[in-house]
Amino acid sequence: KKVVLGKKGDTVELTCTASQKKSIQFHWKNSNQIKILGNQGSFLTKGPSKLNDRADSRRSLWDQGNFPLIIKNLKIEDSDTYICEVEDQKEEVQLLVFGLTANSDTHLLQGQSLTLTLESPPGSSPSVQCRSPRGKNIQGGKTLSVSQLELQDSGTWTCTVLQNQKKVEFKIDIVVLAFQKASSIVYKKEGEQVEFSFPLAFTVEKLTGSGELWWQAERASSSKSWITFDLKNKEVSVKRVTQDPKLQMGKKLPLHLTLPQALPQYAGSGNLTLALEAKTGKLHQEVNLVVMRATQLQKNLTCEVWGPTSPKLMLSLKLENKEAKVSKREKAVWVLNPEAGMWQCLLSDSGQVLLESNIKVLPTWSTPVQP
């Protein structure tokens, strides 16, 4: 008996061939001997089977002695033995229909679990192997689970169902809902405008939800909500914003926040959360703000940074085109009695400058100028 594997929702074509290469009488029946489809001369007839309006043939092949049974929009319960009767012969084909579905939704939040469930006909014993977009293989029986989904798991999962040495391949598109970056850091000189961007790592037709940015300033004892907003069909509307600082928010995606000026009291860490409609859980992105200030007070030139800096960052003070006068893995450096000229305060990571502030030191009879 020939075995054919089909996919739920797909179309399958079961073949039946006569030795005579011409249109002759044929019938397709199921295992209960109920007529599904056949011919009446040159015309198609259909029996009272449950397949009635989903069964078809290919009339153009009848003259060649081929009498296929085409079943569209396959259902698991279409799994059966189908018998083609032609020329006093019977050809039997066993059709096994499988379905593979993702647990509730194919749009999942980062960190959530993905469960793939195989629907199979009674009496079958298939094995399933799935390959994720990043090449990770998982194997299982009726269910396969992947915990802690990552951004790289977004894309097409290819799953192969194996039964009777035959295989059928399913492709499932999984979208991991996350921000493009888990964390970002912005370095700014005091007084500069700050732009925070929160690009999403996915695109959907309609995006609705609500969000909030909580901020923990380095100098503050507790965190506070800086802004709350709504998202309706990719349109952003601000619900509530603090008076200090008075953030501004872009009306379109990607989510975009503007802080009018970087000040030491704002330096710190924020957590933007986004709750999407019909989803349990929230998307998170951490954002950090480091602020630099260079000042000259009497005979002391000081450079300071506020905010979450890594211990390996180097803070330096140097006269332009000269070697650094002072370099320390600290958040403040100073030079006493600095020479006149353009001084640079640099925050760097392994030689790469992250933030730079210039201050002009005038001869002692002048007052300092800060560009």
């Epitope: 009446q40 001369g41 015309f43 198609l44 009272p48 078809d56 290919r58």
Partner: antibody, heavy 125, light 107 residues
Amino acid sequence: QVQLVQSGAEVKKPGASVKVSCKASGYTFTGYYMHWVRQAPGQGLEWMGWMNPNSGDTGYAQRFQGRVTMTRDTSTSTVYMELSSLRSEDTAVYYCATGGSDSSGYYYEGYFQHWGQGTLVTVSS
Amino acid sequence: DIQMTQSPSSLSASVGDRVTITCRASQTISNWLAWYQQKPGKAPKLLIYAASTLQSGVPSRFSGSGSGTDFTLTISSLQPEDFATYYCQQANSFPPTFGQGTKVEIK
């Protein structure tokens, strides 16, 4: 219940083309073949061709080969019959028709149980 | 193509009469034959299929018989609503072909 609703009457000049539509409802559109039959004034019935709305396959009567095209739009459950290079003898009522089912649920494509109301196409200079 | 020949081409009868129309195929068509009734300005209506099976909703005064090449439609007792044109059609091979019609008129 099965309903086949055709487009309205048309007047065409010789050499022109006409496209008649037939909108089906009350059954699974892609499950059954659609046929076109015409009837010239005071004359008998003449079969023109068939279309399988599921696959888009077609078959035309020899005398209409090259002049008739049958198409479908599954999203609106509509079949179209276009006849080109019209001549005065193409003046007729054009019917769409589909096969019938008996009380046991057997379907016979070759017997036309359900018919559209007909579309009169007049070809005149 | 299979030729279908109906006779007579027209007949006059009275209400209550028994009417018989014949249809001959140019080659054997088993029992794959249908009969239709058509009234002026209307689409044909299927009366009988498979030579003798009455279509659902059709009055029992209509009956069909025959096999191979010769077929008959009989109206046992003609009613006023039966005055119409009747067509036979073979459903055995492509193209499906119709008889030229038999017009049943009031005497």
